[in-house]
Amino acid sequence: QTSVFPPEVILPRGGSVKVNCSASCDQPISLGMETPLPKKEILPGGNNWKMYELSNVQEDSQPMCYSNCPDGQSSAKTLLTVYWTPERVELAPLPPWQPVGKNLTLRCQVEGGAPRANLTVMLLRGEKELSRQSAVGEPAEVTTTVPVGRDDHGANFSCRTELDLRPYVLKLFENTSAPHQLQTFDLPATPPQLVSPQVLEVDTQGTVVCSLDGLFPVSEAQVSLALGDQKLNPTITYGNNSLSAKASVKVTAEEEGTQQLLCGVMLGNQTQETRQTVTIYSFPAPNVNLTKPEVSEGTEVIVECEAHPRAKVMLNGVPAQPPGPRAQFLLKATPEDNGRSFSCSATLEVAGQLVHKNQTRELRVLYGPRLDEKDCPGNWTWPENSQQTPMCQAWGNPLPQLKCLKDGTFPLPIGQSVTVTRDLEGTYLCQARSTRGEVTREVTVNVLSPRYE
């Protein structure tokens, strides 16, 4: 009978092992080992045993010891099991962005490693074990599906192999793949809310606000705002799970008409969009035309109000008849019309919304000069030594200059408080003069002496 020791060996790949072959008889006719492995007999051996060193063991092998004794020939095998850790442990790339609520499939590939019966593959989130499976196939592929929540954002996923040779080898061999960081996102199914003017006047500034709630992670969200071909530059305010993008928009005459306002919120590999129609319009203030802005009294004046062809105007609160963009009326200029305002208001309907503009013009009426009895009485009688204020008002446009002189030299102090003396008595010639001419009027001052009382 032939014996072999050790009957089983677990050794690292490429390693060496000493194997003892012995025969049951004292003087075997022959004793040896049959193996494809490189072997070296370690001398000296014994009468009935030999020691061999097997080197560079690359794979499992069963070297065979044989002996030929007088009672017969026999053999015995030793079982060499080679162990080695995998050459490649790799977690398949994760999607760049993973939607929250959708399952994520983790896939790990393991190349090499033996003995496979002792090789386990684990999928990990951080250090938490998600799945543990045997390595089957070459390369071995292990998958598991996990639900994804917001708390998985930024989590590291990896794959680890364990080669457990205990109790034969008092060691656990571990290989871990490079970790992959998961980026999760949550973009609600609701489109962004867009608040903007429905109508916008050329060369004026409007404000557009686009907001969306329920975003995660909100800091990664991007907003795109555009009006027609014009990209807007919004200021973005971030809330807990919300964002609000505010932009100013100024439109030019080239953009007149209907434009699409677009707000897009991009997160992960998804986009939510809202479109709104904005009508760009041009609406100059109406024109108020007077045949002449400055006329002499008695002149006929045509006041005309004209606006945008689609507008409806009102002139001094009176609608055009029929309603439309033009209104006019005729007046004979009187002094009372001097400084009179003519207001033209225009209403334009733009996409159902009413916009308003107005314009005012003033009429100047040239008249006078005038000296009336009412404003410049022809006779004053005042007691001597009393306090009096001579009044004489000249009217006209332009405003006339007024002088009241006695004997061509002595002035009457118009509008000033004076003590009445005998010198004040007499007839004064009041003269009102403007660029339009002059008028005169006699004013007599009588002074009552105390002796006549």
């Epitope: 129609t277 409806k312 209403t347 919304q353």
Partner: antibody, heavy 123, light 110 residues
Framework: QSVEESGGRLVTPGTPLTLTCTVS????????MSWVRQAPGKGLEWIGI??????TYYASWAKGRFTISKTSSTTVDLKITSPTTEDTATYFC???????????????????WGPGTLVTVSA | AYDMTQTPASVEVAVGGTVTIKCQAS??????LSWFHQKPGQPPKRLIY???TLASGVSSRFKGSGSGTQFTLTISGVESADAATYYC????????????FGGGTEVVVK
């Protein structure tokens, strides 16, 4: 000045129906006209408007379901393209245009209403 | 769009009492607001226009106030004939997709 609706009747779902609004004492070339409806026991619901020049605007829910058109200087039509039981209501026509002489501006105001016409949609 | 929110939806008032109905616009409508009331089987009747101007033939017990986004209709010395549903209406816009009327307030007179 008056407004009167006509054409309301019982129709089966999907059968188009046209209502007519006839005005007197003023011309549709000077005024905007709105259509408003009221389902039994419910509030007033603006359907749409037609301008003096014939432009039309509709409530979002009414777009594609109703068509407003001017057929003469005194009549405006409202077509219910494919009525459903939800369209059962009294339909009113109202003059919807006014002006403020103090500001000189025009504005929308339903100052003149018709008595309404009842539309019943039932299978 | 100019959303019109009317409160309360329903109110009970005793004869001789005062009732206040509020209407809020989502954006400024200046003073372009009208108030209507409607009785069963009748078309709406305009009571107030331009926020505070009384329509002809309407009792001075009806008073409208407000501008911009907040408006109020006050009925003082309530009479049994005032029992009706009251609506506010914005006169600023009739754009596509517009909201024109408030939801209505039912006034019940005890």
């Amino acid at each position: 000045q008056s407004v009167e609706e006509s054409g309301g009747r019982l129709v089966t779902p999907g059968t188009p129906l046209t209502l007519t609004c006839t005005v007197s004492g003023f011309s549709l070339s000077d005024y905007y006209m709105s259509w408003v409806r009221q389902a039994p026991g419910k509030g007033l619901e603006w359907i749409g408007i037609i301008s003096d020049s014939g432009s039309t605007y509709y409530a979002s829910w009414a777009k594609g379901r109703f068509t407003i058109s001017k057929t003469s200087s005194t009549t405006v039509d409202l077509k219910i393209t494919s009525p459903t039981t939800e369209d059962t209501a009294t339909y009113f026509c109202a003059r919807d245009w006014s002006y403020d002489s103090s500001s000189g501006y025009y504005y929308y105001d339903m100052d003149l209403w018709g008595p309404g016409t009842l539309v019943t949609v039932s299978a | 769009a100019y959303d019109m929110t009317q409160t309360p939806a329903s109110v009970e008032v005793a004869v001789g009492g005062t009732v206040t109905i509020k209407c809020q616009a989502s954006q400024s409508i200046n003073s372009w607001l009208s108030w209507f009331h409607q009785k069963p089987g009748q078309p709406p009747k305009r009571l107030i226009y331009k926020a505070s101007t009384l329509a002809s033939g309407v009792s001075s017990r009806f008073k409208g106030s407000g501008s911009g986004t907040q408006f109020t209709l006050t009925i003082s010395g309530v009479e049994s004939a005032d029992a009706a549903t009251y609506y506010c209406q914005q006169g600023y816009s009739r754009s596509d997709g517009e909201h024109v009327f408030g939801g209505g307030t039912e006034v019940v007179v005890k």
